[in-house]
């Protein structure tokens, strides 16, 4: 059928609570595409009726809630103007009773459910809650060994639990809980997180990686509109800023009056081991003064540039 197959690493999930998966693969979902979800190679698409327990919500598949029998391989088919991609997602559902210590740990936990705090540092845990816009999440509560976390060393900030002056006693089993509301119904989301402590300073000095641009030139005609993405991978809990600069000045400040060149709104896709961030720069109209100038994408300490250049003349036209 001419679709390119892409395989998601297995997702292991907890029964009896909501779960959502967004059909996104950055190289192909950035343009005009249609997305359709299927289960186990069925020819019948997943329902789009919001009252259905399992339904497609825009590019997401949403389980309200997930049940043990929902395990299986789901496919989302992404159709673009001149391409088709089929993403296979293997969902394994298990029963987990968070406070029952007689039951073993989670099987093959992904990094979202295994997190590290750094001894003696101020650090944080993240509650990974990935749901479509139709789902409204209430405030998050945090638990350690099934007791709600209290104390001045702990601060809840949006989806994070800030832990100051991490000690060895902070290792253990945590859970974050939120109430999700969808179409007037409420559901509990409870994510377990196994926390270990390390003495190594933060993430081995992990540096954001700029995937694109790659310090290269782009041929572009005078007067055209141009949009260039800066794609950056970084750790899940990074605090790096990402932006476009020219002449060491933020493009929005540099072109404050004309607004001819603007930085776009940053978006990100959460992957298992990292986040992929995208922030674009838009040239509403390329002018002569733009050629030869390095437009720099900054991500923390990492930088990469593009340089616009006039296309070589096409003598065949004469």
């Amino acid at each position: 059928d001419g679709c390119k197959d892409i395989f998601m690493k297995n997702e292991i999930l907890s029964a009896s609570q909501p779960f959502a998966f967004n059909c996104t693969f950055p190289p192909i979902t950035s343009g005009e595409v249609s997305v359709t979800w299927y289960k186990n190679s069925s020819k019948i698409p997943v329902s789009k009726i919001i009252q259905s327990r399992i339904h497609q919500d825009e590019t997401w598949i949403l389980f309200l809630p997930m049940e043990w029998g929902d395990s299986g391989v789901y496919q989302c088919v992404i159709k673009g103007r001149d391409s088709c991609h089929r993403i296979h997602v293997n969902l394994t559902v298990f029963e987990k009773h968070w406070c029952d210590t007689s039951i073993g740990g989670l099987p093959n936990l992904s990094d979202e459910y295994k997190q590290i705090l750094h001894l003696g540092k101020d650090d944080s845990l993240t509650c990974h809650l990935h749901f479509p816009k139709s789902c409204v999440l209430g405030p998050i509560k945090w638990y350690k060994d099934c007791n709600e976390i209290k104390g001045e060393r702990f601060t809840v900030l949006e989806t994070r639990l800030l832990v100051s002056n991490v000690s060895a006693e902070d290792r253990g089993n945590y859970a974050c809980q939120a109430i999700l509301t969808h179409s007037g119904k409420q559901y509990e989301v409870l994510n377990g997180i196994t926390v270990s402590i390390t003495e190594r300073a933060g993430y081995g000095g992990s540096v954001p990686k700029i995937i694109y641009p790659k310090n290269h030139s782009i041929e572009v005609q005078l007067g055209t509109t141009l949009i260039v993405d800066c794609n950056v991978t970084d750790t899940k809990d990074n605090t790096n800023l990402r932006c476009w600069r020219v002449n060491n000045t933020l493009v929005d400040d540099y072109y404050d009056e004309s607004k001819r060149i603007r930085e776009g709104v940053e978006t990100h896709v959460s992957f298992r081991e990292h986040n992929l961030y995208t922030v674009n720069i838009t040239f509403l109209e390329v002018k002569m003064e733009d050629y030869g100038l390095p437009f720099m994408c900054h991500a923390g300490v990492s930088t990469a540039y593009i340089i616009l250049q006039l296309p070589a003349p096409d003598f065949r036209a004469y």
Epitope: G2, D5, I6, F7, K9, S83, F271
Partner: antibody, heavy 125, light 107 residues
């Protein structure tokens, strides 16, 4: 530094089998597909197939089904290709090549960003 | 299988010149196309992936363009080390297939 180190040249008789190896280092072996590619003398490149080192799943070019068998040993970070029923047509240089993969939550076919140095196989009586 | 037709099969050029090769896919492959350089007696080396993206460490004089079924590869200001064979490859669907190659020779 990513490296793919292939086994040495092979001189084999028609009808025999040979097992080539490709040892990976400098990255997590199970994160990327390993491909095998054939190049006959003075010719273009032919994709034989690929193996997913994390679970051993394989995908073959139909032209090489029954001819090539792809396996891995995760503990040795090594991929293998066994070639069976060799004829003079199989005389070529065989390369292993790692699939480039930015999005580490996914596995998919993509360009090969690192290649082994190649193993020359000569089939002659 | 998707056929990849590369042209020209060979080309002569001088140092400092620019050259362009083309690659035609027998069906649409989006931008799932790679370009490789192979010097005599050596392994192929990835230059371009995703039709237009420069691989790590590859000089910016190499560039790729195109999507769907028609693709181009350009080298500007040829250097001595650029004289080699070049292959396109579709990675849209298995079996992955290569073009027949373009041999770039010094004039």
């Amino acid at each position: 530094e990513v490296q793919l180190q292939q086994s040495g040249p092979e001189l084999v008789k028609p009808g025999a089998s040979v097992k080539l190896s490709c040892k990976a280092s400098g990255y997590t072996f199970t994160d990327n597909y390993m491909n095998w590619v054939r190049q006959s003398h003075g010719k273009s490149l032919e994709w034989i197939g690929r193996v997913n080192p994390s679970n051993g799943d394989t995908k073959y070019n139909q032209n090489f089904k029954g001819k090539a068998t792809l396996t891995v040993d995760k503990s040795l970070s090594t991929a293998y290709m066994q070639l069976n029923g060799l004829t003079s047509e199989d005389s070529a240089v065989y390369y292993c090549g790692r699939t480039k993969n930015f999005y580490s939550s996914y596995s998919y076919d993509d360009a090969m960003d690192y290649w082994g140095q190649g193993t020359s196989v000569t089939v002659s009586s | 299988d998707i056929q990849m037709t590369q042209s020209p099969a060979s080309q002569s050029a001088s140092l400092g010149e620019s050259v362009t090769f083309t690659c035609l896919a027998s069906q649409t492959i989006g931008t799932w196309l790679a370009w490789y350089q192979q010097r005599p007696g050596k392994s192929p080396q990835l230059l371009i992936y995703a039709a237009t993206s420069l691989a790590d460490g590859v000089p910016s004089r190499f560039s790729g363009s195109g999507s769907g079924t028609q693709f181009s590869f350009n080298i500007r200001s040829l250097q001595a080390e650029d004289f080699a064979s070049y292959y396109c490859q579709q990675v849209y669907t298995t079996p992955l297939t290569f073009g027949g190659g373009t041999k770039l020779e010094i004039k």
